[in-house]
């Protein structure tokens, strides 16, 4: 056959679907690789062809669209499973072609089993809610296109294994799950099960996501430098090791980049000739507030080093702060025989 633009195996789109549930999978060509959509391609006389390679096989084979009850079908640029079976797992290819043009891409599809509490190897999306922020909602994801708007599905929400049905601070409202006030105790996995009829059959869609309750923007503050501070003086003799921690607290801020850095005499450590090392550690609170510690270390400090200015800087979306460490050279202890004796007038 003539040359085909092969986009290879698109592992970025590792599609996971639950066993025995409907799945609709759009050909990724139109989503991510080509500059035109399916309608344009179809109007131009291009045909979309599907085939697949079973798990642990090398042989590409056509998809059987003649299964009982049209279990697998194609509609425009969508491949439908009504429903999936475990052995549908494999690499699927969609190819767009006519006599003069050809483009194709493959993607992995994994059919996943779940237990009665919705536990499975499925990678779960994480939804962050602000703590004690007021009303926030999550919406049952990825159910568009499965049934027409005229069909009214029933939706059941679960936290972990348990159906949510009491009027506590988390309230199911159809496709939405409303958190009247999000608390740390609301952290966990939430599942919506959407049940809808189609051609005399009943289908279920199961969608699980992880809720993580994080710090509220109402409580967010600029970075707070706990160390260095005015109460600690780093007093060293030449030749000793100088260790100065810079410890900074950052409020959780969605999509904020938290930065901590040292300057020595106004320059980044990389830009000066001192033999300095910096080690960073990061810890998080339950609401994802962050504490970053950068320890500046000079193994054998010189008297010149002890005269330099050491400043810790921190920046987040809330602002930028800086604090200088108090560094000084230790005055050598007097040698008794000479200094003290002279002090007492001994000759």
């Amino acid at each position: 056959s003539e040359r085909c633009d092969d986009w290879g195996l698109d592992t970025m789109r590792q599609i996971q679907v639950f066993e025995d549930e409907p799945a609709r999978i759009k050909c990724p060509l139109f989503e991510h690789f080509l500059k035109f959509n399916y309608s344009t391609a179809h109007s131009a006389g291009l045909t979309l062809i599907w085939y697949w390679t079973r798990q642990d096989r090398d042989l590409e084979e056509p998809i059987n669209f003649r299964l009982p009850e049209n279990r697998i079908s194609k509609e425009k640029d969508v491949l439908w499973f009504r429903p999936t079976l475990l052995n549908d797992t494999g690499n699927y290819t969609c190819m767009l072609r006519n006599t003069t043009y050809c483009s194709k891409v493959a993607f992995p599809l994994e059919v996943v089993q779940k237990d009665s509490c919705f536990n499975s190897p499925m990678k779960l999306p994480v939804h962050k809610l602000y703590i004690e922020y007021g009303i926030q909602r999550i919406t049952c994801p990825n159910v568009d296109g499965y049934f027409p708007s005229s069909v009214k599905p029933t939706i059941t929400w679960y936290m972990g294994c348990y159906k949510i049905q009491n009027f506590n601070n988390v309230i199911p409202e159809g496709m939405n799950l409303s958190f009247l006030i999000a608390l740390i105790s609301n952290n966990g996995n939430y599942t919506c099960v959407v049940t809808y009829p189609e051609n005399g059959r009943t289908f279920h869609l199961t969608r699980t996501l992880t809720v993580k309750v994080v710090g509220s923007p109402k409580n967010a503050v600029p970075p707070v430098i706990h160390s260095p501070n005015d109460h600690v003086v780093y007093e060293k003799e030449p030749g000793e090791e100088l260790l100065i921690p810079c410890t900074v607290y950052f409020s959780f801020l969605m999509d904020s980049r938290n930065e901590v850095w040292w300057t020595i005499d106004g320059k980044k450590p990389d830009d000066i000739t001192i033999d300095v090392t910096i080690n960073e550690s990061i810890s998080h609170s339950r609401t994802e507030d962050e504490t970053r510690t950068q320890i500046l270390s000079i193994k054998k400090v010189t008297s010149e080093d002890l005269k330099r200015s050491y400043v810790c800087h921190a920046r987040s979306a809330k602002g930028e702060v800086a604090k200088a460490a108090k560094v000084k050279q230790k005055v050598p202890a007097p040698r008794y025989t000479v200094e003290l004796a002279c002090g007492f007038g001994a000759t």
Partner: antibody
């Protein structure tokens, strides 16, 4: 189309109980909550409580706690509101109303007038 | 005494614009969504606005809602005689227990 049909007007003596019914049709009964709201003559709206027809769980306004009971019968798509120890200030139109908690109450019954008089 | 405060009455001429305010606190309006209802004389209330500013299907765009801080506002433009009714704001509060709250109602008179 969504319909909430309530039982007829009631006249009760102080100290008695009243049970108002609300039959739902035109939608999946267990997919929406049912509120009960009352309106005394010439007054505003007062929320009494809510029932989840799916599991039967309830939440009552503090003011009515201990005096009100909301129940449902899924086989007939009907909810009930019983108010006990009636007093004259309970004279009002009682509405059942379908809706969620955070996005409004979208369909209301026609109302049931309960008169408490000795 | 309602938890949400509305003016008892407002009036305007046909074709005019009118606003009805609803004042609450951080524990109700401040943190939550507001709905608005219209109650024509002798009828059950009807939902006009939910989620602060969304209209159910069938509600004309002459009706609008907004929220700022602990107050909400219902706006009606191109006033018509059939708009003469009582209007109620509604939200909820949750402090370990759910409580749906209504404003005291505002009587709109079309002059």
């Amino acid at each position: 189309q969504v319909q909430l049909v309530q039982s007829g007007a009631e006249v009760k003596k102080p100290g008695a109980s009243v049970k108002v019914s609300c039959k739902a049709s035109g939608y999946t009964f267990t997919s929406y909550y049912m509120h009960w709201v009352r309106q005394a003559p010439g007054q505003g709206l007062e929320w009494m409580g809510i029932i989840n027809p799916s599991g039967g769980s309830t939440s009552y306004a503090q003011k009515f706690q201990g005096r009100v009971t909301m129940t449902r019968d899924t086989s007939t798509s009907t909810v009930y509101m019983e108010l006990s120890s009636l007093r004259s200030e309970d004279t009002a139109v009682y509405y059942c109303a379908r809706g969620f908690v955070t996005s409004g109450i979208d369909y209301w019954g026609q109302g049931t007038l309960v008169t408490v008089s000795s | 005494q309602s938890v949400l405060t509305q003016p008892p009455s407002v009036s305007a001429a046909p074709g005019q614009k009118v606003t009805i305010s609803c004042s609450g606190s951080s524990s109700n309006i401040g943190n939550n969504y507001v709905s608005w209802y219209q109650q024509l004389p002798g009828t059950a209330p009807k939902l006009l606005i939910y989620d602060n500013n969304k209209r159910p299907s069938g509600i004309p765009d002459r009706f609008s809602g907004s929220k700022s801080g602990t107050s909400a506002t219902l706006g009606i433009t191109g006033l018509q005689t059939e708009d003469e009714a009582d209007y109620y704001c509604q939200t909820w509060t949750y402090t370990g227990r759910l409580w749906i709250v209504f404003g005291g109602g505002t009587k709109l008179t079309v002059l």
